[in-house]
């Protein structure tokens, strides 16, 4: 039993649980379609463990395989609304280093008013992970509503 | 190898890899909006390895970040149904200890007879998490359609 | 800190940590509504650390829990499109053995064109994941719109 | 700046309806909505519904399902609220505000309709 | 629907005191909550969004703070300006709920 207990006093870190669920923030100025993050205790129940916030934008500090997921809800929104709005669509995506740019995950909201997935990924240290949202549309700030998150899985 | 072997060994709650799968036992009485859940191996795929069932309602045994997922597919549906008996909401939160109660999750189904998704969250020993279904609509007890698990990802 | 150290040298199929993220190769012939993947590094993102191809159905090498995820986008689709082609439909079980054939996961594409969710479930090595897509309407071969993947969680 | 300009004060008698206007003048008629807020003399703060002007949509509070419908006129950058089947309690000052929606916040209001509704 | 309560329903104060007001939620609203400033015979305005963002051009000597259930709006140093009735407001779910109001009277 003494092993479990040695396990449990290893840095976390060592172990490579990079972790991170974010709520939202803001939304870009005109022009700009990215959302941005905020994450940390004192803003309620997200946190960052290994990544980091740049801007606003997700920083990955450990390479590996991940799990990205995120759930965004349109603020004021009826299945009507969502249909005439199309297309709104909500892309996931490396943004810089821009040599390892690419989409990850795109979801257009069609008739509905929130999207939710997952995907897993390779991710390395120093890709910022950015999420896109196109249309004119706001994204709900209610952190039960729209959430984002990583959380690694293998190197 | 004879260090994996000894890692094997290891009780696995030692590392604590607390998980649950569950399926839709019922619905509750008129004003009650939870769904009551059941998992175990004699009911087919779904289970639970470390988290107990209280009345129907996941209580968690470990501290820690776990990954929140649920499925639920209403039961006599089209896309026309679900926008008529529009609002029908599903919320995953903690509603006990009471100190502890807050929204994790929420989704409307709009036109869509669907919803999925799934957020990583800190939850305590002793956090029991509900599920409610507020509308007119029932929602199906398909194993494949409706389901509510959570993983121990990290302390 | 050499305990940590050693731990990562140790070989990672020690640990378990399987883990597959696949893409969109082709649908199948008339008569067939399962979907072919295919996965490796040649290929962009996609990946497969443990589990195989089977004639581009996944194949499970390792017994434990496994977090299967899917998301399915229509190729070409408007909530309009989608809502005629009525009932179209997605299913993630496993096909082989026979004997263990069952649905785990099921989803219908209503008004919208996007379809995405995930779930716990046991697989035991040998078992073949199929993916199912009823109707008539073709998916996304993009690699941010439709992907599959099993994650091992524990034993 | 955004300005929401209010049609001008009424008096109505039980039962009957009454139909106020809201122009918005300044900003991108679009993302947001405009919810109407009501406030009887002395009391607090009641939102009733929001409509979207780009779309239509709407979405009222239940207290006032049945009774309020808002609709809008694009070309006029102009929405409407209109209340049926008026009694005493509806005696109150009608606000229209611009509306982010859930978790943002009302961030500029039109200056107000006193509608009296009196036998 | 969510009933928010504030405290106290009036308060007296000079000008340079700390004036503080507390609004709850009658359940957890994470911090989806607004403060609004209302003078009597004008519209509302916002001075604080998401429990505690100062709305822009808002005076810095307002400020907002709280999450889940309880809420505070803290004035640091009254002006004659201030005084007015303050409105708390949930965007958690609709309908939107107001607070009762708080009316912040000259000493």
């Known amino acids: 039993q003494r092993f479990a207990q040695a396990q449990q006093q290893l840095p976390l870190e060592s172990l490579g649980w990079d972790v991170a669920e974010l709520q939202l923030n803001h939304t870009g100025p005109q022009q700009d379609p990215r959302l941005y993050w905020q994450g940390g205790p004192a803003l309620g129940r997200s946190f960052l463990h290994g990544p980091e916030l740049d801007k606003g934008q997700l920083r990955i500090h450990r390479d590996g395989i991940y799990m990205v997921h995120i759930q965004v809800t349109l603020a004021i929104c009826s299945s009507t609304t969502a249909s005439r709005h199309h297309p709104t669509t909500l892309a996931v995506g490396i943004c810089s280093p821009a040599s390892r740019s690419i989409s990850l995950l795109r979801l257009s909201f069609h008739q509905g008013c929130t999207i939710a997935s997952q995907r897993l990924t390779p991710l390395a240290r120093g890709d910022t992970l950015c999420t896109n949202l196109t249309g004119t549309l706001l994204p709900s700030r209610n952190t039960d509503e729209t959430f984002f998150g990583v959380q690694w899985v293998r190197p | 190898q004879r260090f994996a072997q000894a890692q094997q060994q290891l009780p696995l709650e030692s590392l604590g890899w607390d998980v649950a799968e569950l399926q839709l036992n019922h619905t509750g009485p008129q004003q009650d909006p939870r769904l009551y859940w059941q998992g175990g191996p004699a009911l087919g795929r779904s289970f639970l390895h470390g988290p107990e069932l209280d009345k129907g309602q996941l209580r968690i045994h470990r501290d820690g970040i776990y990954m929140v997922h649920i499925q639920v597919t209403l039961a006599i549906c089209s896309s026309t149904t679900a926008s008529r008996h529009h609002p029908t909401t599903l919320a995953v939160g903690i509603c006990s200890p009471a100190s502890r109660s807050i929204s994790l999750l929420r989704l409307s189904f709009h036109q869509g007879c669907t919803i999925a998704s799934q957020r990583l969250t800190p939850l305590a020993r002793g956090d029991t998490l509900c599920t409610n279904l507020t509308g007119t609509l029932l929602p199906s007890r398909n194993t494949d359609e409706t389901f509510f698990g959570v993983q121990w990802v990290r302390p | 800190q050499r305990f940590a150290q050693a731990q990562q040298q140790l070989p990672l199929e020690s640990l378990g940590w399987d883990v597959a993220e696949l893409q969109l190769n082709h649908t199948g012939p008339q008569q067939d509504p399962r979907l072919y993947w295919q996965g490796g590094p040649a290929l962009g993102r996609s990946f497969l650390h443990g589990p195989e191809l089977d004639k581009g159905q996944l194949r499970i090498h390792r017994d434990g829990i496994y977090m299967v995820h899917i998301q399915v986008t229509l190729a070409i689709c408007s909530s309009t499109t989608a809502s005629r082609h009525h009932p179209t439909t997605l299913a993630v079980g496993i096909c082989s053995p026979a004997s263990r054939s069952i649905s785990l996961l099921r989803l219908s594409f209503h008004q919208g064109c996007t379809i995405a969710s995930q779930r716990l479930t046991p697989l035991a090595r040998g078992d073949t994941l199929c993916t199912n897509l009823t109707g008539t309407l073709l998916p996304s071969r993009n690699t941010d719109e439709t992907f599959f993947g099993v994650q091992w969680v524990r034993p | 700046q955004v300005q929401l300009v209010q049609s001008g004060a009424e008096v109505k008698k039980p039962g009957a309806s009454v139909k106020v206007s809201c122009k918005a003048s300044?900003?991108?008629?679009?993302?947001?909505?405009i919810s109407w807020v009501r406030q009887a003399p002395g009391q607090g703060l009641e939102w009733m519904g929001w409509?979207?002007?780009?779309?239509?949509?709407?979405h009222y509070a239940q207290k006032f399902q049945g009774r309020v419908t808002m609709t809008r006129d694009t070309s006029t950058s102009t929405v409407y609220m209109e209340l049926s089947s008026l009694r005493s309690e509806d005696t109150a000052v009608y606000y229209c505000?611009?509306?982010w929606g859930s978790g943002w916040y009302v961030d500029y209001w039109g200056q107000g309709t006193l509608v009296t509704v009196s036998s | 629907d969510i009933q928010m309560t504030q405290s106290p329903s009036s308060l007296s104060a000079s000008v340079g005191d700390r004036v503080t007001i507390t609004c709850q939620a009658s359940?957890?609203?994470?911090?989806?909550l607004n403060w609004y400033q209302q003078k009597p015979g004008k519209a509302p305005k916002l001075l604080i969004y998401?429990?505690?963002s100062l709305q822009s051009g808002v005076p810095s000597r307002f400020s907002g703070s709280g999450s889940g259930t309880d809420f505070t709006l803290t004035i640091s140093s009254l002006q004659p300006e201030d005084f007015a009735t303050y409105y708390c407001?949930?965007?958690?779910?609709?309908?939107?709920?107001f607070g009762q109001g708080t009316k912040v009277e000259i000493k």
């Open positions: 505000a611009r509306d």
């Open positions: 300044g900003g991108t008629f679009s993302s947001y909505a």
């Open positions: 409509i979207s002007p780009n779309s239509g949509d709407t």
């Open positions: 359940q957890d609203i994470s911090d989806s």
């Open positions: 998401s429990a505690s």
């Open positions: 407001q949930q965007s958690f779910t609709t309908p939107y709920t």
